[in-house]
Interface confidence: low
């Protein structure tokens, strides 16, 4: 064991170094002192530290630690913030495209339905966007509302064009008949299944990313305990009291101190690992009906098929609905 | 700072998303994110080591500081002495995490449970049933362009997969209203509508 270097007889080095941390020299002793009031940098002999300096060192050590923690998480934080923003935007674009495709389908195939169809399609996709962002909307209700709204227009414009299209009471009857008679066959049910599954997954994916940001932000801004501050001071700054400016902490010692300071934070590890692996599982399953891009961009096609299904069965349906909604129709012609 | 993605080109006339070499789909972007996240899977357990390696620690020096004195780097005293006669490290660990950390752990537990619930087991029966119910109807198969409409002039073609983050200016003339015309806003035409903090390859 080599002998320690002689203490700085004038504390000059310590003073010039401390000045960088705290302008104003009044806290640094002129010459080494016994340091009996020190609580962290317990002296083995004369020391160039005072109680005030010790306090400043503790504050600086905790700040250093906070900055080290922040820089450690910077890349991860950017990664998640960036992707949360990117995916949120991407999903909005998909919804916008899906709406455009559906409107285009109506415009090209059923121009007589367009004004009202555009309105119903718009409302449906607005709800889709809100749902993805966390709104408390029921997907089945959204799909039912779309078909409930579309059917009266299809009936009055395509199946039975002679009827006045402003008839509110027949509209109500038609909305009811739509469900009772399963006018669109199994298509609404099919769309409900696809849309609810894909949107649920999308929504939780975004929620998970936003929670990821919250986790990093929480650990990023942790305030370290006084005990930790003392351990860090002892490791990083107590050597200065002996005039040992250039000496660095031992590696093993640093690890022990850090594990002590980080004990609480490290407890997140198990759940963080699980979070990433669970997110991976979710992402691996995001295909076909669990992929909103796939489902929403194909929706126009399914809606088109559903209208063709209605048209195919138009004769039978018109007769049945004629009987079912006769009361409403009579009142209307009066 | 470079915050924006690449352009994605759309031929508006036929509503066909043009294929741009190497552009990403959303699913590939998701997988890429997971791969990057997995490189941070040990982030919290590795933190103590990371911070030691990013703060001054004796690596090549013969002597190092153990909290009380100058010692030889590989001596027994290098890790041990600094902790003696100080507050108890075990005690520090026993205090448990701060309330904010406990709260965030609870939130993680909750989302993990949700994520697990949502991650369906392999061979999902639903997929099969849906196919039988005619999800992929007509001649427009998986790898082809999906078809809109029946035939003739009413037909519009679209790519089944939207290339990742399609152009932000895309607005069909039937977008929003009975008026059938909507202008794309100047902001939409820009490439930089989000802080991408990096590249979209």
């Amino acid at each position: 064991q080599p002998p320690p270097p002689p203490p700085d007889a004038t504390c000059h080095q310590v003073r010039s170094f401390f000045q960088r941390l705290q302008p104003g020299l009044k806290w640094v002793p002129e010459t080494p002192v016994p340091g009996s009031d020190l609580q962290v940098c317990l002296p083995k002999g004369p020391t160039c530290c005072s109680r005030k300096m010790e306090e400043k060192y503790q504050l600086t050590a905790r700040l250093n630690m906070e900055q080290l923690l922040q820089s450690a998480s910077m890349e991860l934080k950017f990664l998640i913030i960036q992707n949360a923003a990117v995916f949120q935007e991407a999903f909005e674009i998909v919804v916008r495209h899906a709406k455009n495709y559906t409107n285009a389908m109506f415009k090209n195939n059923y121009p007589s339905l367009t004004p009202q169809a555009f309105e119903f399609v718009g409302e449906f996709f607005t709800d889709v966007s809100l749902y993805i962002l966390g709104s408390d909307i029921n997907v089945d209700d959204m799909v039912n509302e779309l078909f409930d709204s579309l059917f009266p227009v299809i009936y009055t414009q395509l199946m039975n064009p002679g009827l006045p299209d402003s008839a509110l009471d027949i509209n109500e009857c038609l909305r009811g008949a739509r469900r009772d008679l399963k006018v669109f066959g199994n298509f609404p049910k099919l769309i409900m299944t696809q849309v609810s599954k894909s949107l649920q997954v999308t929504r939780i994916f975004l929620q998970a990313l936003n929670l990821g940001i919250e986790v990093i932000n929480t650990t990023d801004h942790l305030k370290f305990s006084k005990d930790c501050g003392r351990m860090l001071t002892r490791m990083w700054y107590c050597s200065y009291c002996q005039g040992l400016m250039m000496v660095k902490p031992c590696g093993g010692y640093c690890n022990v101190v850090m594990q002590g300071c980080m004990a609480g934070v490290v407890e997140i590890d198990k759940y963080w690992r699980e979070y990433i692996l669970s997110l991976e599982e979710l992402v691996n399953g995001m295909y076909r009906i669990y992929d909103m891009e796939n489902v929403l961009l194909g929706l126009f096609s399914t809606i088109h098929d559903s209208i063709q299904y209605v048209q195919k069965n138009a004769g039978k349906l018109t007769t049945t609905i004629g009987k079912l909604c006769a009361h409403s129709q009579q009142r209307q012609y009066r | 700072s470079a915050y924006y993605p690449e352009d994605l080109f759309i031929d508006k006339k036929v509503l066909k998303v043009a294929h741009v070499e190497h552009e990403e789909t959303l699913s590939s972007r998701r997988r890429e994110l997971i791969q990057k996240l997995k490189s941070f899977i040990s982030f919290y357990s590795a933190l103590p080591g990371y911070i030691c390696s990013h703060s001054p620690v004796a690596e090549n020096d013969t002597l190092c500081w153990n909290g009380q004195e100058l010692v030889e780097r590989y001596s027994q005293k290098a890790a041990r002495n600094g902790m003696k006669n100080q507050f108890n490290l075990h005690e520090l660990k026993m205090k448990g995490p701060e309330p904010v950390v406990s709260q965030i752990i609870d939130k993680l537990k909750h989302i993990n449970q949700l994520l697990r619930t949502m991650s369906m087991p392999k061979g999902r029966v639903l997929d099969k049933n849906l196919d039988e119910e005619g999800f992929e109807s007509g001649d427009c198969g998986d790898d082809e362009d999906e078809c809109i409409g029946g035939s003739g002039d009413g037909m519009i073609k679209v790519k089944n997969q939207l290339r990742f983050l399609a152009e932000l200016a895309y607005d069909l003339d039937v977008d929003d209203a009975p008026g059938n015309s909507q202008q794309a806003t100047p902001k939409d035409n820009e490439i930089s509508t989000f802080h991408n903090l990096g590249n979209v390859h």
Partner: antibody, heavy 107, light 108 residues
Amino acid sequence: QVQLVQSGAEVKKPGASVKVSCKASGYTFTSYGISWVRQAPGQRLEWMGWINAGNGNTKYSQKFQGRVTITRDTSASTAYMELSSLRSEDTAVYYCATVVYWGQGTL
Amino acid sequence: EIVLTQSPLSLPVTPGEPASISCRSSQSLLHSNGYNYLDWYLQKPGQSPQILIYLGSHRASGVPDRFSGSASGTDFTLKISRVEAEDVGVYYCMQALQTPLTFGGGTK
């Protein structure tokens, strides 16, 4: 840690070209785009253009279009900015920047 | 292009006092994903600009918590709760919503 180290100061005659380099270290070079920004004496900061370090795609400010070329060499983790047809008003400090990190500047 | 107008041009402050810098944008910098695409930079004498705040209100790592960013419509504010001697320099706002990226004129 992340560092962007730029090439040294240059003195050029009007009409000439200049090529400034920006060597990146401390992160995966291809993961982030690199912007070039200049600051003429007493003027505000001015964005010149950007390169996607992953695939080499570029975006230039209208003001510099045709005069500026931004390239990169992934094997050397280095980005380059070449400005041609120099004029006296191009006298400035030129910075490269990635995410939130900036180079030290090249006069 | 988006024009950013910063005020004041110069701001003399005594250490320990709060300070506030304003940046007004010629158009909204709020993206539909909820983030404001505005950053704040500090350029100390003889140095490169360094990031303080990104995405309107996110403090960059290593930046003291006396710095904060806020937004109200097209008005953005950088606040320093207690100015320290080391905070001397020129502060710039920068928008990243669309190209060309543009900067404010700076506040000294």
